[in-house]
């Protein structure tokens, strides 16, 4: 993870900091995972494309009573503080496949690392 800093542009690039912190939190979750994350709760998988932060929030918010991911839920809210319009929500909720929270977090982490490397901070 320390390598991620090398991809940051010189000078302050505001959104990159938030993205890096979200990545660090997801790394923390995956590294500290002992028992099944959130007791093996299942969540809807998402398309890791436009609207990804809102979609990830919408999926993970349905996991309750799992303190391990509450910080992640709140950090995702930082990227998606206001609800997207009703029309946009239809594309966020392609509810056909459920996966374990642990796998969801790993998939999201891999994608966010890729975005960070490519400098796509939004």
């Amino acid at each position: 993870l320390t390598c991620l800093g090398g991809f940051a542009s010189p000078g302050p690039v505001p959104p990159s900091t938030a993205l890096r912190e979200l990545i660090e939190e997801l790394v923390n979750i995956t590294q500290n995972q002992k028992a099944p994350l959130c007791n093996g709760s299942m969540v809807w998988s998402i398309n890791l494309t436009a609207g990804m932060y809102c979609a990830a929030l919408e999926s993970l918010i349905n996991v309750s009573g799992c303190s391990a991911i509450e910080k992640t839920q709140r950090m995702l809210s930082g990227f998606c503080p206001h609800k997207v319009s009703a029309g946009q929500f239809s594309s966020l909720h392609v509810r056909d496949t459920k996966i374990e929270v642990a796998q969801f977090v790993k998939d999201l982490l891999l994608h966010l690392k890729k975005l960070f490397r490519e400098g796509q901070f939004n």
Epitope: P15, E21, I61, P81, H82, K83, N122
Partner: antibody, heavy 118, light 111 residues
Framework: EVQLVESGGGLVQPGGSLRLSCAAS????????MSWVRQAPGKGLEWVAS???????YYPDSVKGRFTISRDNAKNSLYLQMNSLRAEDTAVYYC????????????WGQGTLVTVSS | DIQMTQSPSSLSASVGDRVTITCKAS??????????VHWYQQKPGKAPKLLIY???NLESGVPSRFSGSGSGTDFTLTISSLQPEDFATYYC?????????FGGGTKVEIK
């Protein structure tokens, strides 16, 4: 200490401009969305603007095109540039940490008074 | 815009009383099973403070005598046993639709 401190309020004439600032401390400012909420004297609360951690901005119609919210993560600071001010913009302006539509406005500053009057 | 109507606008109560404040939205503020309503407390000359998020979730550090309930358009904030520090104005807020809107407030005064 986790806190938000607003500054920049004051008396301004109708049609004038003012820039409010909010200094954040005690938390990782860059990870949070932030908002401005105002309260006219003796009245209720009104949401004014929000900015996400990815710099997306949101405004109600009442201030759209006149107010601009921005942030400087390097300085842990939030700003509200207010142009074309009207008498009805007179209020205490609060800076608030916005944890999104699922979690609400979780931390507020003490506010700064803006008076628009000739 | 979604209108949030609180009642009563003010009430007088004594320490130890059970107090109930209601908030009615002009349309449903439910979203995929969650009620996007939050409650705040504001004391004179002070900033608001979040008490309850998502209709019924107690914010960290808030005393358990505060509770929230409701769904759809009708919501309630309850203080089970009013304490001296609870005399304040309470606001509900919806975040289901932009613009976010607040209720007009309920002032809880000492009887």
């Amino acid at each position: 200490e986790v806190q938000l401190v607003e500054s920049g309020g004051g008396l301004v004439q109708p049609g004038g401009s003012l820039r409010l600032s909010c200094a954040a401390s005690g938390f990782t400012f860059s990870s949070y969305a932030m908002s401005w909420v105002r309260q006219a004297p003796g009245k209720g609360l009104e949401w004014v603007a929000s900015i996400s951690s990815g710099d997306t901005t949101y405004y109600p119609d009442s201030v759209k095109g006149r107010f601009t919210i921005s942030r400087d993560n390097a300085k842990n600071s939030l700003y509200l540039q207010m142009n074309s001010l009207r008498a009805e913009d007179t209020a205490v302006y609060y800076c608030a940490r916005n944890e999104g539509y699922y979690f609400g406005l979780t931390l507020w500053g003490q506010g700064t008074l803006v008076t628009v009057s000739s | 815009d979604i209108q949030m109507t609180q009642s009563p606008s003010s009430l007088s109560a004594s320490v130890g009383d059970r107090v109930t404040i209601t908030c009615k939205a002009s349309e449903s503020v439910d979203h995929f099973g969650w009620s996007l309503v939050h409650w705040y407390q504001q004391k004179p000359g002070k900033a608001p403070k979040l008490l309850i998020y998502r209709a019924s979730n107690l914010e960290s550090g808030v005393p358990s005598r505060f509770s929230g309930s409701g769904s759809g358009t009708d919501f309630t904030l309850t203080i089970s046993s009013l304490q001296p520090e609870d005399f304040a104005t309470y606001y509900c807020q919806q975040s289901n639709e932009d613009p976010w809107t607040f209720g007009g407030g309920t002032k809880v005064e000492i009887k």
